[in-house]
């Protein structure tokens, strides 16, 4: 028998840590599963945003280019639409995701900078401007939201909300990488996290989630966009690697 569960491999069944984890999982449910992408834009330069009516020029990192954000949103929406099959049933992200306000709001939690724009291309493109000046656009909205992620109104001419579609705030340190201090506009990477429900002693539900994760991995592995460099991981990734290693060891 090949053991591939990291918990079984790296903690003794009677250890204090294992006992406490068992207690927690049994009483509160296990910590959710995470599917995560880290995205960079290697072919894009940083750019400068000049606020109107005044203020210092603000540099924006390569992945915060409007075209890159649209492409990342396309990718994110495509991932949301991934379907898997388990036991002759279709499994979607909606079936397994963490939706904290369900049933009133069934939207999945997606920790992504795009959720400042409610995962919408049209909100991302929302702009107040004319031939001469841009008074408010995605730059303005981003700069406001990283300071007040739970806001329902960015106080610019756009009056757009920052709150994610799942009903919660998206903290900038969870969705951006490579910035200095709290200058989130200097980010060199975007991080997108899909938290998925985890299950204690419910093998079927667990396997449904794993089936979706498998399709997620296949999709991202085969995703081609020269403007984006994508690193990714799924909750099952460690187990998959252990499986691969174990199989080769057996042979």
């Amino acid at each position: 028998r090949v053991t591939t569960n990291p918990v079984d491999l790296w903690s003794a069944p009677s250890s204090q840590a294992r006992l406490e984890k068992e207690y927690f999982d049994q009483h509160f449910g296990p910590f959710f599963r995470t599917e995560q992408l880290i995205i960079r834009a290697p072919l894009t330069d940083k750019h400068i945003y000049q606020p109107y009516p005044s203020g210092a020029d603000v540099p924006f990192g390569p992945p915060l280019d409007i075209q890159i954000l649209h492409q990342v949103l396309d990718l994110q929406i495509a991932i949301e639409n991934i379907t898997a099959s388990y036991d002759n049933e279709t499994v979607t992200l909606q079936d397994i995701c963490l939706a904290p306000l369900s049933p009133y709001n069934t939207n999945c939690t997606i920790l992504s900078v795009l959720n400042y724009f409610q995962n919408s291309h049209s909100v991302l493109d929302h702009k107040k401007g004319d031939d001469f000046f841009v008074y408010a656009d995605y730059h303005t909205h981003f700069l406001y939201c990283v300071r007040a992620p739970a806001s329902l109104n960015d106080t610019s001419l756009l009056h757009d909300p920052c709150l994610g579609t799942f009903g919660g705030p998206v903290f900038p340190w969870l969705v951006l990488g490579g910035y200095d201090d709290q200058n989130y506009n200097n980010a060199t990477a975007l991080v997108i996290t899909f938290p998925v429900n985890n299950y204690y002693n419910d093998t079927e539900k667990l396997q449904r989630a794993q089936a979706w994760e498998k399709e997620f991995i296949n999709f991202v592995k085969n995703y081609k966009n020269p403007n984006l460099t994508i690193s990714f991981t799924a909750e099952r990734s460690i187990e998959d690697e252990l499986n691969r290693e174990s199989d080769s060891d057996v042979f």
Partner: antibody
Framework: DVQLQESGPDLVKPSQSLSLTCTVT?????????WHWIRQFPGNRLEWMDY???????NYNPSLKSRISITRDTSKNQFFLQLNSVTTEDTATYYC??????????WGQGTTLTVSS | DIVMTQSHKFMSTSVGDRVSITCKAS??????VVWYQQKPGQSPKLLIY???TRHTGVPDRFTGSGSGTDFTLTISSVQAEDLALYYC?????????FGGGTKLEIK
Amino acid sequence: DVQLQESGPDLVKPSQSLSLTCTVTGYSITSGYSWHWIRQFPGNRLEWMDYIHYSGSINYNPSLKSRISITRDTSKNQFFLQLNSVTTEDTATYYCARWGATGFDYWGQGTTLTVSS
Amino acid sequence: DIVMTQSHKFMSTSVGDRVSITCKASQDVNTAVVWYQQKPGQSPKLLIYWASTRHTGVPDRFTGSGSGTDFTLTISSVQAEDLALYYCQQHYTSPWTFGGGTKLEIK
């Protein structure tokens, strides 16, 4: 409070050049906004002429581009309009104004220019 | 250039009346329209921006509406001090242009 004040000649002869000054108090013209010239003809029609942005960039109304110039003196917090080869058609009240992100929110009181020989 | 047409040069009204001043753009200007009030002997004063947002300090009897090509400034209950010229202006496309103005007269 932000205040704008136009100054310049009351009378200019046809074919001469016109120079107007807008003195801004209460806000630095290099700190923000864009600073514009607008004129109002007898009969009340308004025409936007040009602007200078706080960064120094400039834009002109294409209908005036060949004979108009806008400059500034940051040390005096002033900006200037020069209009060449004036004709009687340039007789108007000339206003300087600040463009907020919402409209012309501050105006000078205007200076009336007559072009006549 | 975009032409802003204010079809009524003059409008006569009584104190307490509701009056609507219209402005038509020769092409789509989205909501990039501003309304100004100019009282005799004074400079124009900003009333409404982005077609429908009241500028700070403007009484709430003034409301703006419209988008695309048709815009309206409404005074819900005219006061004697509202006697003035009213202009619309588009800033959607260069050059920025103004309407010819509508003079509001009190009967």
